[in-house]
Interface confidence: low
């Protein structure tokens, strides 16, 4: 019969014949022949292969280095790589999460719009009129100015985006 030029899914062409690929979690030891099946072996400890493959070596699991602020989010298996994330207060510098940086703080005059996660940094926004932030923080939102009226007081000093209003007693008309 005519040798194949293409093979089915989960097969590969070698020496003019179709051999079965090794399943995820296993590596290729020897190609199939006319008389024998493809020989595969499971990946060792700390190794993985995540696809049907003809790889002769498994990949090493990623190491989540605590010296870079990383920790294991999910341990690897023979079929999956280890997933790293960052320690609390830090976030990944890239999608691959190879290292971490401290969450950014929002300066006075800015508040936190969105708190940082393990994979995204703090999002800050300027405090609009009527709101202020007097601290540098990775958690604090802009606070509304104090309402002097509700306390039967008057505004003695106007608020800014960094300071609250200062309230004082109302001037009393002398009799």
């Amino acid at each position: 019969p005519e040798p194949p030029t293409a093979c089915r899914e989960k097969q590969y062409l070698i020496n003019s014949q179709c051999c079965s690929l090794c399943q995820p979690g296993q590596k290729l030891v020897s190609d199939c022949t006319e008389f024998t099946e493809t020989e595969c072996l499971p990946c060792g400890e700390s190794e993985f292969l995540d696809t049907w493959n003809r790889e002769t070596h498994c990949h090493q699991h990623k190491y989540c280095d605590p010296n870079l602020g990383l920790r294991v989010q999910q341990k690897g298996t023979s079929e999956t790589d280890t997933i790293c994330t960052c320690e609390e207060g830090w976030h990944c510098t890239s999608e691959a999460c190879e290292s971490c940086v401290l969450h950014r703080s929002c300066s006075p005059g800015f508040g936190v719009k969105q708190i940082a996660t393990g994979v995204s940094d703090t999002i800050c926004e300027p405090c609009p009129v009527g709101f202020f932030s007097n601290v540098s923080s990775a958690f604090e939102k802009c606070h509304p100015w104090t309402s002097c009226e509700t306390k039967d007081l008057v505004v003695q000093q106007a608020g800014t985006n960094k300071t609250d209003v200062v309230c004082g007693p109302q001037d009393r008309l002398r009799a």
Epitope: P66, N67, E87, E88
Partner: antibody, heavy 121, light 106 residues
Framework: EVQLVESGGGLVQPGGSLRLSCAAS????????MSWVRQAPGKGLEWVSV????????YYADSVKGRFTISRDYSKNTLYLQMNSLRAEDTAVYYC??????????????WGQGTTVTVSS | SYELTQPPSVSVSPGQTASIICSGD??????VCWYQQKPGQSPVVVIY???KRPSGIPERFSGSNSGNTATLTISGTQAMDEADYYC?????????FGGGTKLTVL
């Protein structure tokens, strides 16, 4: 031979201070994270603090946070534990330990012989 | 804070298999180390990375970890294995030890 030798333990009054030292030899000191672990009389192991290989990161057990400070001197190949505001419950044998690789997962593969700290009036 | 629980004591006859359990919430998601400590001595790591044995540790020591339980197994236990055993993990910037298990070889 890889070796860790602790010193600086002794008797101290509650509220007092003490500085423990751990002299390292036989390995590249700057390549490994280092920990302090303590063991109260008749009790189990309790982790105290760890410092990263570069010295840039330090972590503490809640029970000592704010009172103890871990540090390392690369020129002297020495690890330190500065202990302030000591309490009776800090009484223990203090071990210095080397992390087993760039992996923290290797566990602590070398331990010192320990130095005894007694906090009592 | 994260907690690891171990039985205070386990007894075994010489030549038999000893199993020491360490349990914790989703412990299988973390890497476990085991330490042996004999009276008056410093601890020694016998298993790291769940199931790896450092050089110099006898083959009779093995480890496994899945679900909420890690197990240290000593097959063909010898009198010299009598000691305290501690499990340990690295969790969210802290090192956590189990309370320890005293292994008695009858």
């Amino acid at each position: 031979e890889v070796q860790l030798v602790e010193s600086g333990g002794g008797l101290v009054q509650p509220g007092g201070s003490l500085r423990l030292s751990c002299a390292a030899s036989g390995f590249t000191f700057g390549s490994y994270a280092m920990s302090w672990v303590r063991q109260a009389p008749g009790k189990g192991l309790e982790w105290v603090s760890v410092i990263s290989d570069s010295g840039g990161r330090t972590y503490y057990a809640d029970s000592v946070k704010g009172r103890f400070t871990i540090s390392r001197d690369y020129s002297k190949n020495t690890l330190y534990l500065q202990m302030n505001s000591l309490r009776a419950e800090d009484t223990a044998v203090y071990y210095c330990a080397k992390e087993g690789g760039d992996y923290y997962y290797y566990g602590m593969d070398v331990w010192g012989q320990g130095t005894t700290v007694t906090v009592s009036s | 804070s994260y907690e690891l629980t171990q039985p205070p004591s386990v007894s075994v006859s010489p030549g038999q298999t000893a199993s020491i359990i360490c349990s914790g919430d989703k412990l299988g998601d973390k890497y476990v180390c085991w330490y042996q400590q004999k009276p008056g001595q410093s601890p020694v790591v016998v298993i790291y990375h769940d199931n790896k044995r450092p050089s110099g540790i006898p083959e009779r020591f093995s480890g496994s970890n899945s679900g909420n339980t890690a197990t240290l197994t000593i097959s063909g236990t010898q009198a010299m294995d009598e000691a305290d055993y501690y499990c340990q993990v690295w969790d969210s910037s802290t090192v956590v030890f189990g309370g320890g298990t005293k292994l008695t070889v009858l």
